[in-house]
């Protein structure tokens, strides 16, 4: 899977959208590596 910063950001946005935003506060692009997905 793509692990550039932009890919990570878009994947996280999709995850947040699907979860209704119910995730940990530190679950942000600059804290999350591609392996988190």
């Amino acid at each position: 899977a793509c692990d550039t910063a932009t890919c990570v950001t878009h994947r996280l946005a999709g995850l947040l959208s699907r979860s209704g935003g119910v995730v940990k506060n530190n679950f942000v692009p600059t804290n999350v590596g591609s392996k988190a997905f």
């Epitope: 550039t4 932009t6 890919c7 942000v28 600059t30």
Partner: antibody
Framework: EVQLVQSGAEVKKPGASVKVSCKAS????????MNWVRQAPGQCLEWIGD????????NYNQKFKGRATLTVDKSASTAYMELSSLRSEDTAVYYC????????????WGQGTTVTVSS | DIQMTQSPSSLSASVGDRVTITCKAS??????VAWFQQKPGKAPKSLIY???YRYSGVPSRFSGSGSGTDFTLTISSLQPEDFATYYC?????????FGCGTKVEIK
């Protein structure tokens, strides 16, 4: 309201360095990567690199590696792009840009900083 | 580096026309492509990410499609404010690379 506000236009001599700033507001600066892109007159857009403001990690376009340096001042929510050993071909508009998720999912760009390299 | 080849480099169209711009990547970039609109003297404005998703606030007349190496931006009914230059970008691999633009002019 998310804003990326860049420093003003610069005129530099060949061989000099320039440091462009990008002040972020309206979101948590350390949560999102900051990109730097440039556009020379009549040329394509060129990606310079990105920086993780949280940890300071960087990715550079090899074309600029060794000449471009990306840094941040977390306390001031400001990103910087320094370009050294300037040549006339570096005359361009330099942009910072960041894809933000909260408060609004969008790809925000600064207004651009014109850097002119001329003897 | 991945080359992004846009075509045409310019086109003339009238208000109400359907406009299609294509972008070809030199290697597979999955759907990791964005499209931007730029007007003279202004910063680029983001329209599309992940090949086909519109950012909030982008009019529905703009749509993107494609995957792998071939991508398309379509404007279903051109409006006066749409006359601008459009760029594609891949962000699947570092360094990110852009197409050299398609200028949409008034016929």
């Amino acid at each position: 309201e998310v804003q990326l506000v860049q420093s003003g236009a610069e005129v530099k001599k060949p061989g000099a360095s320039v440091k462009v700033s990008c002040k972020a507001s309206g979101y948590t600066f350390t949560d999102y990567y900051m990109n730097w892109v440039r556009q020379a007159p009549g040329q394509c857009l060129e990606w310079i690199g990105d920086i993780n403001p949280n940890q300071g990690g960087t990715n550079y376009n090899q074309k600029f590696k060794g000449r471009a340096t990306l840094t941040v001042d977390k306390s001031a929510s400001t990103a910087y792009m320094e370009l050294s050993s300037l040549r006339s071909e570096d005359t361009a508009v330099y942009y910072c840009a960041s894809i933000i998720i909260v408060p609004n999912y969008f790809d925000y760009w600064g207004q651009g900083t014109t850097v002119t390299v001329s003897s | 580096d991945i080359q992004m080849t846009q075509s045409p480099s310019s086109l003339s169209a009238s208000v109400g026309d359907r406009v299609t711009i294509t972008c070809k990547a030199s290697q597979n970039v999955d759907t990791n492509v964005a499209w931007f609109q730029q007007k003279p003297g202004k910063a680029p404005k983001s329209l599309i990410y992940s090949a086909s998703y519109r950012y909030s606030g982008v009019p529905s007349r703009f749509s993107g499609s494609g995957s792998g190496t071939d991508f398309t931006l379509t404007i279903s009914s051109l409006q006066p404010e749409d006359f601008a230059t459009y760029y594609c970008q891949q962000y699947n691999n570092y360094p990110y690379t852009f197409g050299c633009g398609t200028k949409v002019e008034i016929k």
